[in-house]
Amino acid sequence: VSPTFQVVNSIAPVQECSTQLDIVIVLDGSNSIYPWDSVTAFLNDLLERMDIGPKQTQVGIVQYGENVTHEFNLNKYSSTEEVLVAAKKIVQRGGRQTMTALGIDTARKEAFTEARGARRGVKKVMVIVTDGESHDNHRLKKVIQDCEDENIQRFSIAILGSYNRGNLSTEKFVEEIKSIASEPTEKHFFNVSDELALVTIVKTLGERIFALEAT
């Protein structure tokens, strides 16, 4: 051993996912999502587990409600730290309508293009977070099939907050969001009681996303 050898304290990285994936997170930003910082906390906890970079995992975020906004593209940031800073700054765009089919279709057609950073041969993953039945659900079946045709793996998360606040039945909503998830549904669909509970699914969601690279 060299005489200059010394022990240096090292910190184990938070990242658990050092795989190559192109992940687009599709966020419902309509008014009924409350409080919004529960969503940004969820994003933070999920993203800090990822090893983000041009040769590792890339993340893009799309927000929808009445219309769709690309918050940032897959190739916008080249490190986990940069993505965490950007995700924290995402503001809720509001709106009363929940155009989920439009959000998913825009992510498929636009966010997953090479122009926005998608890489050929890299597995595509979409994470959809919403709290209400879509106002364009007549389009949902075709939109999901289009994603399926393009081999986009879909994880869907149903937030039951607005239903519980209004003492409304969640049955129809849960069925719709389950229909968005890839098969097997039980591994791709999550539901949480309210927005505050989003952080409780991060570990499991992260593990299931990262497991995709092994399949």
Epitope: S30, N31, W36, G94, G95, R96, S162, G166, L168, D194
Partner: antibody, heavy 124, light 108 residues
Framework: EVQLVQSGAEVKKPGESLRISCKGS????????IGWVRQMPGKGLEWMGI????????RYSPSFQGQVTISADKSISTAYLQWSSLKASDTAMYYC??????????????????WGQGTLVTVS | EIVLTQSPGTLSLSPGERATLSCRAS???????LAWYQQKPAQAPRLLIY???RRATGIPDRFSGSGSGTDFTLTISRLEPEDFAVYYC?????????FGQGTTVEIK
């Protein structure tokens, strides 16, 4: 930068009509509810009602139902509070505020994150 | 409707001291949907805390909120000169917004 800018102070006589305004900027004004809050001289805050400028859906506090009218013109990102016949007891500071939350179906919830500077209405 | 009662009505303290403001609801506030606002003379209210304990953007960490159900507290750990003002609590869990009557924090 999110801003709510209210119209200037008004001095009116009892029985007169009045409309005050609140113009939003720096965010998608048609996508957030706007509330109105009254503060009588030396007193606390009272919620009056709320409107969604995107489609003018409106809810009123029972205490103010029938006493005032809340409206909006989404083309100019402005919400209004109006009286058809003012009373001396309407003398107060009136604030508009943006709701971070929702008011769909039977449930309303959320906090007011941005406020206008206030419009003082004096009726005497 | 839910009635909010704030206490004390007035709190006389010196800069650097700790301020504890109480807000009690006549019935349980659902999902801890309670906010705190600060209002200075001739100014609009300013959001401090929402969902009982979450600090609004730009609010210093000397302000903290706690509580659930019917009892809520706003704490200012060390009073700064600019903190002397009126503080209102507000509930929003019942399709209506109601405010407490306010607590005045004044310089001793």
């Amino acid at each position: 930068e999110v801003q709510l800018v209210q119209s200037g102070a008004e001095v009116k006589k009892p029985g007169e009509s009045l409309r005050i305004s609140c113009k939003g900027s720096g965010y998608s004004v048609t996508s957030y509810w706007i509330g109105w809050v009254r503060q009588m001289p030396g007193k606390g805050l009272e919620w009056m009602g709320i409107i969604y400028p995107g489609d003018s859906d409106t809810r009123y506090s029972p205490s103010f139902q029938g006493q005032v009218t809340i409206s909006a013109d989404k083309s100019i990102s402005t919400a209004y509070l109006q009286w058809s016949s003012l009373k001396a007891s309407d003398t107060a500071m009136y604030y508009c505020a943006r709701l971070q939350g929702d008011c769909s179906g039977g449930t309303c919830y959320g906090h007011f994150d941005y406020w206008g500077q206030g419009t003082l209405v004096t009726v005497s | 409707e839910i009635v909010l009662t704030q206490s004390p009505g007035t709190l006389s303290l010196s800069p650097g001291e700790r301020a504890t403001l109480s807000c009690r609801a006549s019935q349980s506030v659902s999902s801890s949907y309670l906010a705190w606002y600060q209002q200075k003379p001739a100014q609009a209210p300013r959001l401090l805390i929402y969902v009982a304990s979450r600090r609004a953007t730009g609010i210093p960490d000397r302000f903290s909120g706690s509580g659930s159900g019917t009892d809520f507290t706003l704490t200012i750990s060390r009073l700064e000169p600019e903190d002397f003002a009126v503080y209102y609590c507000q509930q929003y869990g019942t399709s209506s917004w109601t405010f407490g009557q306010g607590t005045t924090v004044e310089i001793k």
